[in-house]
């Protein structure tokens, strides 16, 4: 018989790590005894059921170091269904891992702290309803050195009170280095805390004033976070209660003796003013975050940066004035100061010119790297005052309210009425797209010398005097506008530098052969969801362009419905990678051989992405005439019913083939040619419920493979033959495999268990009724004892 | 040396209104809070409110909330309480008294006498 | 609110002498205790704060002890210009004075 996994229903992962998370459990499992219990040292139990743990449950794991019992229990005001849950935990429950370094018990009802190993380091009791801290409830845990109790008394969680922490309760805890007590209704820093803090995070409570006693001793504190004790509640994403002064008040010496702090948050604080003397004496700081107060004013002429010769990173976003936009805005001459400031974020502070003056102080600083200045309602901005900045490599100006080049008219008054805010900004990064090689289909322009960022603006035309002095440029991103003019070699003249240009989500007409031509450094341009001119009947459209940007490794035209009237073939010899996923080719391959050649004109071509293209076939000439440099293709969630996989040959060296999302009912039609470099081989989430003997076996290079979320009975070592114990990834998950007694598949699946990921979990039965939806190794199917089973043999 | 001086004494009568100040040197009148007391005669000592110059904010006793109300002018250094509808109730010393946490430092106090 | 009771509300002692005068509050005040001597005439007097801390320039025949809900103030070695009202402070929430204690020479 196959060894059965050694400890199910959980999974082992590297490392010593027993994942049985998510697995419905009540009680903490016992291990078989084959199961090597002395050499696990991390085990997790998060989103599990078990309400109850007893003294007995972790003798077994005596070398436990790391232990997850997160989301067990919740508390009623966290609980999905806001159910009432008391967690009890026997006296002697977690002595008996005298290793044990690391424990959460977060969000889970309990009330007390249990007795804990003197060898722990690290501990989590956030989101619970334990609301006093005392001398008793850490006694002897002197090796702790990080202590996180967040959440236990705000409106998810409400208390009646505040958590209580007593004066001196920590102080045995000589190691301490971390403590986190956010969200606890406290009104004041606990007391006598251990002088060896680095880390004291107390931000959102209700501590709406702070002296240098409730420091005091605290002289090691590297990072310290008193945010959102006193909020701007028109700035809340959440339940905000309105703080009962003006602003938090801070004494001018609270942090004098702070000599070794690094990191000084005071967000969402209500501040109005910044007093110099505040940051007198940290001379060490290197981030600062002041973002979500009133500093509006304050910015403009404060002189309390004058001494931060070592700030790295200062946040001042969203200072602006309830219902209020300025015309303008100038930073006060003590930002001058900040001779190491890498990155300065000034969004949301709502002001509409950005000139020469605006910044003028920063233009000095020969570190700063980093200039946020999104969601200001900008509509007149003089790009060309970057060229000043020395070191200047990301401004980010997305979400704002720019439309073209303009000159800067004066204008008058302060303000122009109600605007709020309506959005958060969000993560405008694209995901990385998995790839044989490292050519990432979208170049990361963090590693690029100088980006600009002005998606989510109101440009309609792009001209070139926008651009003007940024030759430097390398990165432009211009995604979600309204730019729907057609581009004819002349818009983006200056910027001669530049690689890598996003233009996505537009309405460009490409039309012109010369389109993007004055790019001679152009290397990867994003012209996806720019589909409403393609969709204009009638109306052509020419890709010749392409052929023209000899130094263009990745293009996008993902997403543009194209179905007719372009080119009849793209070409280029540069060209890496070509995302095309999201288009018309079942329409663009059916108009007879009009088509068929269209890609065939990329003759360096590696990364290919046809998904999403309503293609019903896929003939072996369409394959044959696709360049033959390719590594990576993928056809995902097209209308593929059949595949010729014999013409794979005519793709010598394809590595990837994803086919996932498509309506293959069976891998039949021969079997995977000999000689292909197929390296990974994704058919999830088709319909497959059977496979030829020995499909895959010809393709010696086959390490992945991804079957799941097919309509598979059986998984058989004879699709595989000799190749079974190469596959490093076979994925079988979400099949309804049929677990009668003896089932083939069982021996088999246990033999490559190395290479089934989620094999004790996610590996489920379809058939008979009663495992349906249970894990194959709910009943042990290799020896008949039940007898429906048997019957069903 | 931190000093408050307070207004002389004030002879009132029923119903009306008053205002006594608090003149404070030494030391940065923004960055501290500024309370006031109440000693009526035979009594003990009773909390009336504060005022936190750097930003106007005030917080009052209830008992007190109404007819109390505390203002500060930065540019003298000066805090005041008005007082209003006064009774016979209302005659007692009242100080003035510097804090942070706990009040460190205090005026000689205000009499007032409410009589008709 | 939090009350303070403070007892006894007079007491007489002999020069060189010591007393005791504590106040109890209404719930745990976590140290936030202050005492002050107040002398007629004058301003109250800043003693001790955060429940034993002397503040500079007071004599340490004065100290202070406590937590929780109960806190004292001693005076030992009892001198003439001791005589006065004392008074305890809670700030642990908002300021709430005791009734005071009246201290007499014999």
């Known amino acids: 018989l196959g060894t059965l996994p050694a400890f199910l229903p959980c999974e082992l992962k590297p490392h010593g790590l027993v994942d049985c998370n998510w697995l419905f459990l009540k009680s903490v499992p016992r291990f078989s005894a084959a199961a090597s219990c002395s050499n696990i040292t991390r085990l997790s139990l998060i989103s599990n059921r078990i309400h109850h743990l007893h003294n007995s449950d972790f003798v077994h794991l005596s070398n436990l170091r790391q232990l997850n019992l997160k989301w067990n229990c919740p508390p009623t005001g966290l609980s999905p269904l806001h159910f009432s849950c008391h967690m009890t935990i026997e006296p002697r429950t977690f002595l008996a891992m005298r290793t044990l370094e690391e424990l959460n018990l977060s969000y889970n009802g309990i009330t007390t702290v249990p007795r804990l190993p003197s060898s722990l380091v690290n501990l989590s009791l956030s989101h619970t309803n334990i609301l006093v801290l005392d001398a008793n409830s850490l006694a002897g845990l002197y090796s702790l050195r990080v202590l996180f109790m967040d959440g236990n008394c705000y409106y998810k969680n409400p208390c009646t009170g505040a958590v209580k922490v007593t004066p001196g309760a920590l102080l045995g805890l000589s190691n301490l280095t971390h403590l986190s007590l956010k969200y606890n209704n406290l009104t004041k820093v606990p007391r006598q805390l251990p002088p060896s803090l680095e880390y004291l995070l107390v931000s959102y409570n209700l501590i709406v004033k702070l002296g240098p006693e409730d420091l005091a001793n605290l002289t090691s504190l590297r990072v310290l976070d008193v945010g959102g004790n006193c909020r701007r509640c028109d700035h809340a994403p959440n339940p905000c209660i309105e703080c009962g002064q003006k602003s938090l008040h801070l004494h001018p010496e609270t942090f004098h003796h702070l000599s070794h702090l690094e990191g000084l948050v005071l967000k969402d604080s209500s501040l109005h003013t910044l007093n110099s003397s505040w940051f007198q004496g940290l001379v060490n700081l290197s981030v600062l975050d002041l973002s979500e107060n009133f500093l509006y004013e304050s910015i403009t002429h404060t002189n309390a940066f004058q001494n931060l010769t070592r700030l790295r990173k200062l946040n001042l976003s969203f200072n602006y004035r309830k219902k209020v936009s300025f015309a303008r805005l100038h930073l006060a001459p003590s930002f001058g100061s900040l001779v190491a400031l890498k990155e300065l974020d000034m969004h949301g502070i709502f002001f509409r010119s950005l000139d020469e003056t605006t910044l003028r102080p920063l233009a000095r600083l020969p570190m700063l790297q980093t200039l946020r200045l999104q969601m200001n309602f900008i509509n007149q901005a003089q790009l060309g005052i970057f060229r000043a900045f020395p070191g200047l490599r990301y401004v980010d100006l997305s979400d704002n309210r720019i439309s073209g080049a303009s000159e800067l008219t004066a204008t008058m008054g302060e303000a122009d009425g109600g605007e709020k805010v309506w959005l958060q900004p969000g993560d405008l990064a694209p995901a990385p797209v998995d790839t044989p090689s490292s050519e990432d289909f979208r170049p990361n322009c963090s590693t690029l010398n100088f980006t600009l960022d002005l998606s989510r603006n109101n440009l309609v035309t792009v001209q070139p005097e926008m651009f003007a002095q940024l030759s430097h440029l390398q990165c432009l991103r211009l995604s979600h506008n309204c730019i729907s003019q057609a581009v004819n070699g002349s818009q983006f003249l200056p910027l001669t530098g530049l690689q890598v240009l996003d233009l996505s989500h537009n309405k460009l007409d490409l039309y012109h052969e010369h389109s993007f031509t004055e790019l001679p450094r152009l290397e990867a341009l994003d012209l996806s969801y720019n589909s409403q001119p393609f969709g204009m009947q009638g109306v052509g459209h020419n890709f010749s362009f392409v052929a023209h940007l000899r130094t263009l490794r990745h293009l996008s035209l993902a997403h543009n419905n194209i179905h007719s009237q372009v080119s009849q073939q793209l070409c280029s010899t540069s060209l890496r990678a070509l995302d095309f996923s999201g288009n018309a080719l079942g329409h663009m391959w059916a108009e007879g051989d009009l088509y068929l050649h269209f890609f065939q004109g990329l003759s360096g071509l590696i990364w290919l992405d046809l998904s999403q293209n309503r293609l019903h076939t896929l003939l072996p000439q369409t394959l044959r005439n696709l360049p033959k440099s390719l590594q990576v293709l993928r056809l995902r969630d097209n209308y593929l019913a059949f595949f010729k996989w014999w013409s794979l040959h005519f793709l010598p060296k394809l590595e990837v083939l994803d086919l996932a999302g498509n309506q293959l009912k069976a891998l039949t039609n021969g079997s995977l040619p000999a000689g292909t470099r197929l390296r990974r081989l994704d058919v999830s989430c088709n319909s497959i419920s059977f496979v030829a003997p020995g499909f895959f076996s010809k393709a010696k290079e086959l390490r992945e493979l991804n079957l799941s979320a097919n309509a598979l009975k059986t998984v058989d070592h004879s699709w595989f033959g000799p190749l079974a114990s190469a596959l490093q990834i076979l994925d079988v998950s979400a099949n309804p495999l049929h677990c009668a007694c003896g089932a083939a598949f069982m021996d088999f699946l246990l033999e490559v268990q190395a290479a089934v990921p989620g094999l004790p979990s996610r590996v489920k039965c379809g058939s008979p009724g009663q495992l349906q939806g249970l894990s194959i190794f709910a009943q042990d199917l290799r020896l008949c004892l039940d007898e429906a089973l048997s019957w069903d043999c | 040396q931190v000093h408050l001086q307070q207004s002389g004494p004030d002879l009132v009568k029923p119903g009306a209104s008053v205002q006594m100040s608090c003149k404070t040197s030494?030391?940065?009148?923004?960055?501290?809070?500024l309370h006031w007391v109440r000693q009526r005669p035979g009594q003990g000592l009773e909390w009336i409110g504060w005022i936190y110059p750097g930003d106007g904010s005030t917080k009052y006793n209830d008992q007190f909330r109404g007819r109390t109300t505390l203002t500060a002018d930065k540019s003298s250094s000066t805090a005041y309480m008005f007082l209003s509808s006064l009774t016979s109730e209302d005659s007692a010393i009242y100080f003035c008294?510097?804090?942070?946490?706990?009040?460190?430092?205090w005026g000689q106090g205000t009499t007032l006498t409410v009589s008709s | 609110d939090i009350q303070m009771t403070q007892s006894p509300s007079s007491l007489s002692a002999s020069l060189g002498g010591k007393v005791t005068i504590t106040c109890k509050a209404s719930q745990d005040i976590d140290n936030y205790i202050a005492w002050y001597q107040h002398k007629p005439g004058k301003g109250p007097r800043l003693l001790i704060h955060?429940?034993?801390t002397l503040q500079p320039g007071i004599p340490s025949r004065f100290s202070g002890s406590g937590s929780g809900r109960d806190y004292s103030l001693s005076i030992s070695n009892l001198e003439p210009e001791d005589i006065a009202t004392y008074y305890c402070l809670q700030y642990d929430d908002l300021y709430t004075f005791g009734g005071g204690t009246k201290l007499e020479i014999k």
């Open positions: 008294a510097k804090s942070w946490d706990y009040f460190d430092y």
């Open positions: 955060y429940a034993s």
């Open positions: 030494d030391y940065t009148f923004t960055n501290y809070y």
